[in-house]
């Protein structure tokens, strides 16, 4: 049965952050694991993909990842399927929105002493806690003339008077994070002496060393005062500027100009308007420095003609958000057509060969521009330049079979011989252009060869038959030195093959004819009874019409084959005594004797003081020890043949004589006594 060792469990997740649903399975055989979301199979994407058996989220999405996930393990052989417990995400998020007028229906209907209700359109999960601000100053619940309904995200002013005039903003925070209103609401209830906002400064993003302008205007009767402050509460005037704001200018209309902006100038600027009566109005705007990071590299892509493919360009991080566009051959791609840009994606529909080339993704903002190229290859089915031809190849020489094709990308060529894939080794080599080289053609290379040329778009194949033109050669070549046993019958074979069956004949090397007792029968030299005079040099000649003739020289030696006159016997010796293993052989040429003891040749030059091999071939071992026990082999050899004979040597302890045994008692073994 399939068992889940680890099951996915429901969990909290943060919008845009990583997450992992774990799944681990144990089963008797292999299984494959896939995931369901609300009962439908989950397809891998760059954002959400299988990681082993688990499901990995690079960035949780509250819309696409809401629902029930389930891990399914299937044994495809038996068909058995097991399903994990359901798991879902409690996704925490927060999203900014504007401050809007809820009541009355329009700004034109706002009059002194009427009720005004504003709504904060910031939403999130879990439900965030809201904070209201007038002209940047927090409004606490229960203060005079206003109430805050957190559940309905409303701020109610009842009744609204001139003192309530100002710029209303809201912020909300939750376990996920914090957001402030994307658009604020200016409430204006006339009290001529109160300062009223005419123009509020906006957040500005500028490139380094560029200029930034904040506009700020208030109206009142009499005219109000206006003052600019930077983050650390330092006032900015044309007479007294802070050291880091030397290039700041305050205009008569209240606008603040900053030239050649540097990183230290970034921050919050406050514009304060004060009327003859009423509270000061504080408006805030932030100066951000534009920035843009580098773009990640693209892998080269290979597509097939007729398919639809997409290449995603991930924009670099930057402020403001960089705009992204695709170009090809220096021309910006349209937003529709066959090859077009959709969002950040390059889309190639019904791909054609002409679509191949370099496509560039551009990203730009105030801080600059970044670009990254992607090389797109359109794979084509290979076409023939030269097919393999039926060929006649000469044995022993290199042979070549062509398989020349062209395609994009460069095709892969494989060769088959008798339907079996040829793997490159010392005999076969496939060149870069697809040609097969057979390094040294052999007779059995005569068969069918098939080459297959492939790209991702498809493959073509062709076959050819190879006929091997056999060279004129001895099969096998006669041994150059051969021995014949004196006074015995002997044969010396000689055979050859070629394109045509060759004629084979023997002759003596000196050109003299063969004696009558020596016959040449279809290449086999036959000696009815070998004599000493038969020794000498002979030549085997093989010839045919198209290939001429070849010769093989053989030196025949007449020998008396080896026989043993004396062979070593099974021998038992008392420890400390001397063992003698006799061996004598005869033959012509006179044989040499070698001994092998306990599986190693006894080298006469390295025997040491205890061992000695006599001229006649006998082996003597003095002061024998138990480790000398074993099989000893006498090997007799000459230039014509070799023979061996063996016998065991046993080394035993000398028995202690018992009282009952007289001095004449025989030993318990057949012994050599010395």
């Amino acid at each position: 049965a399939i068992v889940f060792i680890k099951q996915p469990s429901s969990q909290d997740a943060l919008q845009g952050r990583r997450a992992l649903l774990r799944c681990e399975v144990e089963a008797p055989g292999p299984v494959h694991v896939y995931w369901l979301l609300d009962g439908a199979p989950v397809q891998d994407t760059e954002r959400r993909f299988a990681q082993g058996s688990s499901l990995s989220f690079a960035a949780v999405d509250r819309l696409q990842d809401s629902g029930t996930f389930q891990c399914v393990a299937r044994d495809d052989v038996t068909g058995e399927e097991a399903r994990s417990a359901n798991a879902s995400f409690n996704i925490k998020w927060i999203e900014a929105g504007p401050v809007v007028l809820k009541h009355p229906a329009s700004e034109a209907e706002i009059q002194p002493q009427t009720q005004v209700t504003l709504r904060c359109h910031i939403d999130g999960h879990p439900r965030p806690t809201y904070q209201w601000f007038r002209d940047g100053t927090p409004l606490s619940d229960g203060q005079s003339n206003h109430t805050v309904s957190s559940k309905e995200r409303n701020l109610t002013l009842r009744p609204a008077g001139p003192e309530h005039s100002g710029l209303y903003s809201c912020c909300a925070h939750s376990a996920f994070g914090q957001a402030c209103s994307s658009q604020n609401f200016t409430l204006s209830i006339a009290d001529e002496s109160f300062a009223r906002v005419v123009l509020a400064p906006q957040d500005v993003v500028v490139a380094r060393y560029e200029e930034a302008m904040f506009h700020c205007q208030f109206s009142a009767q009499p005219p109000p005062s206006l003052q600019w402050l930077f983050e650390d509460e330092t006032p900015i005037t044309n007479r007294s500027r802070p050291p880091h704001l030397r290039r700041a200018t305050v205009f008569a209309n209240g606008s603040l100009l900053l030239t050649q902006v540097r990183p230290r100038n970034a921050g919050i600027y406050r514009c304060i308007g004060q009327g003859q009566r009423g509270p000061p109005i504080i408006l805030e705007a932030t100066l951000h420095l534009a920035e843009i990071e580098d773009m990640p590299l693209f892998e080269p892509r290979v597509f097939t003609a007729g398919s639809e493919e997409r290449v995603t360009c991930l924009p670099p991080k930057g402020l403001p958000e960089p705009s992204v566009w695709w170009e090809h051959a220096g021309v910006r791609l349209p937003t529709h057509g066959r090859v077009y840009q959709k969002g950040h994606e390059l889309v190639l529909a019904n791909i054609a060969e002409s679509d191949a080339g370099v496509y560039t993704c551009h990203a730009a903002n105030l801080a600059g521009q970044r670009r990254q190229d992607v090389n797109i290859t359109v794979a084509t089915v290979p076409s023939w330049l030269k097919k393999p031809q039926d060929s006649q190849l000469e044995e022993g020489k290199p042979g070549y079979l062509d398989c020349l094709t062209q395609a994009t990308p460069k095709p892969t060529v494989v060769w088959y011989r008798n339907q079996m894939l040829i793997s490159e080794d010392s005999r076969f080599e496939v060149f870069k252009n697809g040609t097969l080289r057979i390094n040294s053609v052999e007779v059995y290379d005569g068969t069918w060869y098939r080459c297959m040329s492939s790209t991702p778009a498809g493959s073509i194949e062709a076959q050819a038959r190879v006929q091997v033109l056999e060279k004129l050669k001895f099969t096998p070549p006669p041994q150059p030195q051969q021995c014949m046993e004196f006074d015995k019958e002997a044969t010396v074979p000689c055979s050859a093959t070629g394109r045509e069956k060759p004629t084979i004949k023997w002759e003596r090397a000196d050109g003299s004819s063969l004696p009558e007792w020596v016959t040449d029968n279809a290449g086999t030299l036959h000696f009815a009874r070998v004599t000493r005079d038969d020794a000498g040099n002979y030549t085997c000649i093989a010839s045919n019409g198209p290939q001429g003739q070849i010769r093989a020289h053989v030196q025949l030696t007449v020998a008396v084959f080896i026989t043993f006159k004396v062979e070593p016997e099974r021998t038992t010796v008392y420890q400390g005594h001397t063992a003698l293993l006799q061996c004598e052989a005869q033959g012509d040429p006179k044989p040499l004797i070698q001994w092998k003891g306990k599986d190693r040749i006894l080298d006469p030059t390295k025997l040491g003081p205890r061992m000695h091999i006599f001229q006649n071939g006998s082996l003597v071992i003095h002061d024998v020890a138990p480790e000398d026990s074993g099989r000893y082999t006498c090997i007799a050899g000459n230039s014509c043949n070799i023979k061996h004979t063996e016998a065991p040597l046993y080394v035993v302890d000398k028995p202690v004589p018992e009282e009952s045994e007289g001095p004449g008692s025989p030993p318990p073994y057949k012994m050599i006594q010395t």
């Epitope: 896939y34 009962g39 397809q43 044994d75 495809d76 052989v77 038996t78 097991a82």
Partner: antibody, heavy 112, light 110 residues
Framework: EVQLVESGGGLVQPGGSLRLSCTAS????????MNWVRQAPGKGLEWVGI???????YYASWAKGRFTISRDTSKNTVYLQMNSLRAEDTAVYFC??????WGQGTLVTVSS | EIVMTQSPSTLSASVGDRVIITCQSS????????LAWYQQKPGKAPKLLIY???NLASGVPSRFSGSGSGAEFTLTISSLQPDDFATYYC??????????FGQGTKLTVL
Amino acid sequence: EVQLVESGGGLVQPGGSLRLSCTASGFSLSNYVMNWVRQAPGKGLEWVGIIDSSGSTYYASWAKGRFTISRDTSKNTVYLQMNSLRAEDTAVYFCARGLYLWGQGTLVTVSS
Amino acid sequence: EIVMTQSPSTLSASVGDRVIITCQSSQSVHNNNLLAWYQQKPGKAPKLLIYYTSNLASGVPSRFSGSGSGAEFTLTISSLQPDDFATYYCQGGYNGNIYAFGQGTKLTVL
């Protein structure tokens, strides 16, 4: 003994409908996936569709709309409902549990 | 639409030969390994030989072996036996619970 037996095959006119049954014995359908595969005379195997252990169904693109797989776990039987039949639907229809266990097949002939 | 292409479509060989059948898919199979090979003889249901690319099914001789990954796979019979002359099919499984068969390779006596 674990086995599968198909039934319901026979002669049907073009445009007609037929329901094939695959009765399982020796195991419970609710823990297994079941496939339908067909083989036209002298031709290769062709996957029709699958019903998984929860009863969800998936089909080959050519089978969507005309063919429907269902099951009755109380009868331990899987069905293949075939509508708007054509001459090219003539084949032996096999049901299979996973890759290993196959039924003997049932012949469907669509002809006028 | 997924297309699985087997090559060759027909193959003649002799007892003792080494035989290789290839299977190419138009897209990668699930987990790069969800591929099976079947043997079918006339009038019989298919018999599973190899599952998950290279695992030998129960009772299948060790002369059968499978290899590959992604979208390209091979079935090898190391030394052809008289009982091996039949039709062979590859079957791939894909994301979304979709399966497909190759068109088959008929192995006949040379």
